[in-house]
Interface confidence: low
């Protein structure tokens, strides 16, 4: 009998054999006809022979990728009637082998990608009555092979990506009452028919990512399971009210890299499982947008608009943001944050704000990094961030501050303050326990962190009169062992860098005199 | 230093009520959460909710939302759980415990009160 | 909510060994886990916070990792004293704990 293995193959006991990147020109002979995966990919194997696999009656899965196959007979395959997975991507056909196929009755997961396939003959998957994955991309189709499609009521995965598909066509999809991811980026589309995605009532994910389309691809109103949708890297310039009307249990929309001049106010209402929304640069925009019933989102982004306020009950209505990034705006007056738990990151910076209340960032007890930074800020009350317990990040550079309240700050990692010019009052490093890297106005306010204060061990001039660091050994008071453990670092050192640098010709002794 | 000191172990009755203390000290008490967690016998530990002494704000693991209530007093630096309608799955190991942040970690732990619920 | 599973639930080592300790997180927790340690009768205690911080007064032996959905923790050389239920912990989002790893000495 017949070794279990032939050489140069390897297989395990079960029943699965490895012939990959072996060197094949055909099919190795001499292996067990139990065998129930056969991986012959990355070989020379340019074409196969009628009865190519008739030794093989119990075979699952075969993988013949990457072998530059320009030629698959008609019988190729036949007597497979167990094949459940075919891999023929990263070969050379140029059309689908539809004979060779065709009697492939168990197959569930074809591969066809990245071939040089430029047409799918009508009668391309008759027959594959369980398929359910296919895999068409990195070929040269100039269409959608509609009439082969209808052939496949089980797909549940389809990809046409990376083709040279222009346009869709009405009821492309109509059959596919299955399908749940349909991939579509990468394309020339331009215009998709009303009626495209009709009969789609499945499809949770539709990828149009990286196409032409210039207007908002409203076919999408036919998908009402849509989960995911991608029309980044588009050309579109509007998304009209009621955009997702049909999709309400959309969570997911990358819509970036388009330019988006408007955005409808009402575009984004009622997407109650949506998690994030992104919009850069809608010029146009002036209202901040209405998100009734929208309320799982967990990042919101709009920036580069000329929304100018923000609503009153934003965290009433959005008690699961995590991020919220409101930057490069005309926001001049901030609601009560209150509400918003889970926040750990906000962005505010570039807009008109001049003033942060006590109750502006009350209740934000997950925050963890604000950015103030480049607004018009005069004055920050007192107790503005005595609630923030686990804030580790924060920049209020370049705004008209002119004191600084501390209290609530002391587990802050960042500190920026540079640029704020009326703000001339001393820091203290007690203050700040846990504090790696700061930026004043001035420089000499970076002496209580070069070796002033008590807290701070002395790192004197002598050693590195260029870096203003210094290193604060953890428990050095009792002050600091209030901090200590895991409220503070893990170290039991922190370096902290702070700028402007006093420089080696201005050492603290001449910026401050005798008080040091 | 710091120290969350729990009162002591409890039987009591289905049906009836219990209050768990947690006296804190060695830190200003206004200024950290207190969490408190269950452990069954034998078993994981379930995070039931918090309490921010500061101004008395609470948040409840939806699963505990009517079996616990959280309360605190600044003047004697104490936080309670009232836990209510007790059946045999409310005996366990109640710990409290501190942070500095709404659910990050908790550096300090009290020593546990245990909860038998049995008539 | 999260569902945090650790393995192996139970886990037999000898001094001086290397032990690695598993969790994984039904979906992305951004790193926002913590490791704790219980020993019998006592109340757990903070080994690791935030993935990979080693919380003050925590032998060196100690370090955790991970991103996404896997976390590790590792005790590069064990020692009596670690036997003990190891828990992680995330709070993403709705705090959960894990199931538990309990470590053994062979």
């Known amino acids: 009998a017949p070794p279990l293995c032939a050489a140069p193959c390897s297989c395990d006991g079960d029943r699965r054999v490895d012939c990959s990147g072996k060197g094949l020109t055909a099919v190795p002979e001499g292996l067990s006809a139990f065998t129930q995966a056969l991986d012959i990919s990355m070989n020379n194997i340019t074409q196969l022979p009628e009865d190519a696999f008739k030794n093989f009656p119990f075979l699952e899965e075969l993988q013949l990728a990457g072998n530059d196959l320009s030629f698959i007979h008609p019988k190729a395959l036949s007597g497979l009637k167990e094949l459940k997975v075919l891999t023929l991507q990263n070969n050379q056909l140029k059309t689908v082998p539809s004979e060779a196929i065709r009697g492939l009755s168990a197959l569930q997961s074809l591969r066809l990608d990245a071939n040089h396939i430029t047409s799918v003959p009508e009668d391309s998957f008759e027959g594959l009555v369980q398929l359910r994955h296919l895999w068409l991309d990195d070929n040269i189709l100039t269409e959608v092979p509609v009439r082969p499609l209808s052939n496949l009521p089980t797909l549940q995965a389809l990809t046409l990506a990376l083709n040279n598909i222009s346009s869709i066509p009405d009821f492309a999809f109509t059959n596919l009452s299955s399908l749940v991811v349909l991939h579509l980026h990468n394309n020339k589309i331009k215009s998709l028919s009303q009626h495209c995605f009709d009969g789609l009532d499945n499809l949770e994910t539709l990828d149009l990512n990286y196409n032409n389309l210039d207007e908002f691809p409203q076919a999408i109103k036919a998908l009402p399971s849509l989960k995911e949708l991608g029309f980044h890297s588009n050309s579109i310039s509007v998304i009209p009210d009621g955009a997702f009307a049909g999709n309400p249990l959309l969570r997911t929309i990358h819509l970036y890299d388009n330019p988006l001049s408007f955005v409808g106010n009402s575009a984004f209402h009622n997407l109650s499982d949506l998690h994030s929304l992104v919009i850069r640069g809608a010029s146009l925009v002036q209202w901040f947008p209405n998100l009734a019933g929208t309320v799982h989102l967990e990042s919101l982004t709009l920036t580069g608009t000329k929304i100018s306020s923000i609503p009153d009950d934003l965290c009433q209505n959005q008690k699961m943001l995590r991020t919220l990034d409101l930057s490069y705006n005309d926001i001049r007056d901030l609601p009560s944050f209150n509400g918003c738990r889970a926040l750990e990151e906000i962005s505010l910076q570039r807009n008109q704000i001049s003033l942060i209340k006590e109750t502006t960032f009350q209740g934000l007890t997950s925050l963890r990094i604000l950015d103030l930074s480049r607004n018009l800020i005069r004055e920050i009350h007192s107790g503005a961030f005595a609630k923030l317990g686990t804030i580790t990040n924060l920049d209020v550079s370049f705004n008209e501050l002119t004191s600084f309240p501390t209290e609530g700050l002391n587990g802050l990692n960042q500190l920026k303050l540079v640029g704020n010019f009326q703000l001339k009052d001393a820091l203290a490093a007690r203050d700040f326990a846990n504090l790696r890297s700061l930026s004043v106005p001035y420089a000499y306010q970076c002496c209580a962190f070069w070796g002033c204060d008590s807290y701070a061990n002395l790192n004197t001039e002598d050693n590195s009169p260029q870096d203003h660091s210094v290193t604060k050994e953890k428990g050095a008071t009792d002050a600091a062992n209030a901090t200590s453990t895991a409220e503070s670092e893990e170290h039991s050192q922190i370096i902290i860098h702070c700028t402007p640098s006093t420089g080696a010709f201005k050492p603290c002794e001449y910026l401050l005199g005798s008080w040091m | 230093q710091v120290q969350l000191q729990q009162s002591g172990a409890e039987l009591v009755k289905p049906g009836s009520s219990v209050k768990i203390s947690c006296k804190a000290s060695?830190?200003?008490?206004?200024?950290?959460?207190i969490h408190w967690i269950k452990q069954q016998p034998g078993n994981g530990l379930e995070w039931i909710g918090w309490?921010?002494?500061?101004?008395?704000?609470?948040e409840y693991n939806q699963k505990f939302n009517g079996k616990a209530t959280f309360i605190a007093d600044k003047s004697s630096s104490t936080a309670d759980m009232q836990l209510n309608s007790l059946t045999s799955e409310d005996s366990a190991v109640y710990f409290c415990a501190r942070s500095k942040s709404a659910y990050n970690w908790f550096a300090y732990w009290g020593q546990g009160t245990l909860v038998t619920v049995s008539s | 909510d999260i569902q945090m599973t650790q393995s192996p639930p139970v886990l037999s080592a000898s001094v001086g060994d290397r032990v690695t300790l598993s969790c994984k997180a039904s979906q992305n927790i951004n790193k926002n886990l913590d490791w704790y340690h219980q020993k019998h009768g006592e109340a757990p205690k903070l080994l690791i916070y935030y993935t990979n911080n080693l919380q003050t007064g925590i032998p060196s032996r100690f370090s955790g990792s991970g991103s996404g959905t896997d976390y590790t923790l590792i005790i590069s050389s064990l020692q009596p004293e670690d036997v003990a239920t190891y828990y992680c912990y995330q709070y993403n989002s709705g705090p959960t704990f894990g199931t538990g790893t309990k470590l053994e000495l062979k």
């Open positions: 309490i921010y002494p500061g101004d008395g704000d609470t």
């Open positions: 060695g830190y200003t008490f206004t200024s950290y959460f």
